[in-house]
């Protein structure tokens, strides 16, 4: 009986693909075929695992047992898993690690461990039989205390490594360094004692390197006790860390060992300070090194209307090609800042505050002189005409996105940077368009907005994107006689000819589903016959139902069928 | 059109507690910040504290941390401030603003009226 | 915390003629170029209205009679021509640093 109730909550399609999480399970079912290729068991209530109950299932390749609250696995359970490529075991109760179970995984390549009460990672090493793993995730967040010199010995390359040290007391030094290569390390540590000693295994075979949810606010660099400068890390992520002027001071010192760091990414960080980076020996210049890209994200900076002057960063920004700098609360970018940003090709300040009249301070002349990518997406810029008028000083602006600001009226005419070249002012409230867009441009996307009418003459416009508004045809292909891509779904068509498509010469792609089709004879004869059409319309058939007449709404374009009578009246 | 409206007058005892709202309409509630201004009868605006519904954060006047707080239901564009240990000295116009550009409180609310008094 | 002075306390005016406000502030207001300075009139029972931003941005509706000046710590809120709708209360308010403070005000009365 129990049996069957397990079986209950489990589904499997043709392909052997078994799906039985969030039930009641409390062991692994036992009635099912050897053709299972895949078993999604988590959030159950198995807590036991012995060496017969997966036996049969010799194609397994997908184990998923995360969140049950397994306690004991019996050294053989996995002996018959040779095919198993992906092993999920996180947030179990597994406090010891044996290196057993996972000797017979000879196909592993996704092992997750993360979330087990273990101190350690065994006695042996538990991975130097797995030589195709390349997903590994161990650590938790109390009692894993230990990294040990053999935990991970045998493994040559991981695309990703996922350690969870938030209560690291021990690091036993060159435990990481065994591991060749890394492409992206995740480290989770709440102190910062032992970062540098990890720090100095990891230089030369990680790209990618990530710390989490860190204290760094009494963070102090030493001079790292290693005579290596061939690194290999070129991306470093600070996530949910905190940080204060002064440690962010020694964090740059740090970074500056990395001759090959080309990307910086802090998010979800918060800075305790007011902006005086200068550090206590501020006799020493940092040197930004080859850092072209720099990406922060919801940055939360408690004294942030108490900042001082920015200008001990400014000289660290003179290579930066591209900032993101999103959902920080950015108001104003100093126009001293602006102006040291010489190299600076890319710059997104998305969910901001920005307005044009602070703008203007930030886009001073001179500022941004490389500039050719602007995004100002959900910023607080309400003047089309105004946005564009602060932009002119930007020459070689060619990439504007303004969308999700509020403009509602559109003016006759405005003035933009001359080379511009794509435009973004989807979700803006505008009800109509005028000659304020550019005739420069190439891509423009006005959709969801409230227009009904689209007649601009855009000489050189390849792609339109003008999706959910509330047009009611195609526009004058006339006006557009480079388009390349029209995107005109969710609106108010009701019909379209093979007249209307021939007259876009050059169009290649047309998206118009989800409008409201009058499925009249001659638009489902046209649409029926003409088989070259599914090339264009990227959406057909799927998107394409009728409105009416009412007997056949809702119904796909391509199915429909009316009666003679109908169609002869 | 952006409005910001605020609930009905309040009549409280000292030691009670009062809470205000005030909901918004006319542009997208969690790109703005919304702060609360006071205003005794006769006198100057006091400024209370603002939030981001965007994602919570809050920041206060320290004459008001103990006792003032602001929550926000995004799903009805609806910000609140409570404030506890009412005293006759709370009596007051109390105002909802809208924040823009950071810096700038560019809609009020038409304002709350508390009064407190035994 | 910042603190504002306005002054004139009141100012009495006859339609026509041109108001000078004050307002100085305890510290510079200034932010990397931008002061942040704002100016709100208030008329009786009414919630104040936004006039100026950063010193010298007028918000939009508002007539051009109305111009800011100043930075660091003196600002100017003119009107070039007093009108009978001008009356009220008129307060600067500093968003340098926190907390945000507003001046006392100056009262506009029309003789």
């Known amino acids: 009986k129990e049996e069957s109730s397990n079986q209950a909550s489990l589904s499997c399609d043709h392909n052997g693909i078994c799906k039985g999480s969030s039930g009641s399970l409390n062991s692994i079912p036992s009635g099912l075929t050897e053709a299972v290729k895949s078993l999604d068991l988590s959030n159950n209530r198995i807590t036991y695992i012995s060496n017969s109950d997966l036996q049969r299932y010799v194609n397994l390749q997908a184990l998923v047992l995360t969140s049950n609250g397994i306690n004991t696995i019996e050294e053989d359970s996995f002996s018959s898993l040779g095919r198993l490529e992906h092993l999920d075991l996180s947030y179990n109760y597994l406090s010891n690690l044996s290196s057993s179970w996972f000797k017979p995984l000879s196909s592993l390549k996704f092992l997750n461990l993360l979330g087990n009460p273990y101190k350690t990672l065994g006695e042996t090493s538990l991975f130097s039989h797995l030589t195709k793993l390349r997903i590994l995730r161990v650590g938790n967040m109390d009692t894993f205390t230990k990294i040990q010199r053999k935990d991970f010995a045998g493994l040559t390359f991981l695309e990703e490594l996922e350690i969870d040290a938030s209560d690291l007391q021990s690091y036993e030094p060159k435990s990481l360094k065994s591991i060749q290569n890394v492409s992206h390390l995740i480290l989770h540590m709440k102190q910062h004692i032992l970062l540098l000693e990890i720090f100095v295994d990891l230089t030369s075979s990680v790209e990618c390197l990530e710390l989490r949810d860190t204290d760094l606010d009494t963070f102090h660099f030493s001079e790292l006790s290693t005579g290596e400068t061939n690194s290999l890390i070129k991306k470093f992520t600070f996530r949910n860390v905190k940080i204060t002027d002064e440690s962010l001071f020694q964090v740059m010192k740090l970074l500056s060992q990395i001759s090959g760091l080309l990307e910086l990414e802090f998010d979800d960080c918060t800075l305790n300070g007011v902006g005086d980076f200068r550090g206590s020996d501020n006799d020493r210049v940092i040197d930004p090194g080859k850092v072209e890209t720099v990406t922060i994200r919801r940055l939360h900076i408690p004294q942030f209307y108490s900042f001082n002057d920015l200008s001990t960063l400014y000289p660290l920004t003179e290579r930066v090609k591209r900032i993101t700098v999103e959902n920080s609360k950015v108001f104003l970018v100093p126009c001293l800042l602006s102006r040291h940003l010489k190299s600076l090709e890319y710059l997104d300040l998305s969910e901001n505050l920005m307005v044009e009249e602070y703008l203007k301070n930030s886009a001073c002349e001179d500022a941004w002189p490389s500039l050719q990518t602007l995004i100002l997406r959900q910023n607080h810029l309400a003047s089309l005409g105004k946005t564009g008028e602060t932009l002119l000083t930007l020459k070689n602006l060619t990439n504007l996105d303004i969308s999700k600001n509020t403009f509602h009226y559109m003016p006759e005419t405005c003035q933009w940077p001359e080379k511009m070249k794509y435009l973004n002012l989807s979700s803006t409230r505008i009800h109509s368009v005028t000659g304020c867009i550019p005739k420069t441009l190439e891509i423009l996307d006005i959709s969801n907005n409230n227009l009904n009418l689209f007649s601009l003459n855009l000489p050189q416009l390849k792609e339109l994107y003008i999706s959910r508004n509330k047009l009611m045809t195609l526009p004058d292909a006339s006006l557009l006689p480079m388009l390349l891509v029209l995107k005109i779904s969710r609106n108010t068509i009701t019909t379209f000819s093979k007249e209307q498509l021939d007259s876009f010469h050059t169009l290649k792609t047309l998206e118009a589903g989800g409008n409201n089709f009058i499925c009249s004879c001659e638009f489902l004869s046209f649409t029926q016959e003409q088989q070259a059409l599914a090339k264009v319309l990227v959406d057909w058939p799927a998107n394409y139902l009728c409105d009416s007449p009412s007997h056949v709404r809702g119904q796909r374009v391509q199915d429909v069928r009316l009666s003679v009578s109908e169609c002869h009246r | 059109q952006v409005q910001l409206v605020q609930s009905g007058s309040e009549l409280k005892k000292p030691g009670a507690s009062v809470k205000l709202s005030c909901k918004a309409s006319?542009?997208?509630?969690?790109?703005?910040?919304i702060n609360w201004v006071r205003q005794a009868p006769g006198q100057g605006l006091e400024w209370i504290g603002w939030?981001?519904?965007?994602?919570?954060?809050?920041n206060f006047n320290e004459n008001f941390k103990d006792r003032a707080t602001i929550t926000v239901d995004t799903s009805a564009s609806t910000a609140y401030m409570e404030l506890s240990s009412l005293r006759s000295e709370d009596t007051a116009v109390y105002f909802c603003?809208?924040?823009?550009?950071?810096?700038?409180?560019?809609?009020w609310g038409q304002g709350t009226t508390v009064t407190v008094s035994s | 915390d910042i603190v504002l002075t306005q002054s004139p306390a009141t100012l009495s005016l006859s339609p026509g003629e041109r108001a000078t406000l004050s307002c100085r502030a305890s510290?510079?207001?200034?932010?990397?170029?931008?002061?942040?300075m704002q100016w709100y009139q208030q008329k009786p029972g009414q919630p104040p209205k936004l006039l100026i931003f950063g010193a010298s941005n007028v918000e939009s509706g508002v007539p051009d009679r109305f111009s800011g000046s100043g930075s660091g710590t003196d600002f100017t809120l003119k009107i070039s021509r007093v009108e009978a709708e001008d009356v009220g209360m008129y307060f600067c308010q500093q968003s340098r640093k926190l907390p945000w403070t507003f001046g006392g005000g100056t009262k506009v009365e029309i003789k």
């Open positions: 006319g542009f997208t509630f969690t790109t703005y910040g």
């Open positions: 603003a809208r924040l823009t550009g950071g810096t700038f409180l560019d809609y």
């Open positions: 939030i981001y519904p965007r994602d919570g954060s809050t």
């Open positions: 510290e510079s207001v200034e932010y990397y170029g931008t002061s942040l």
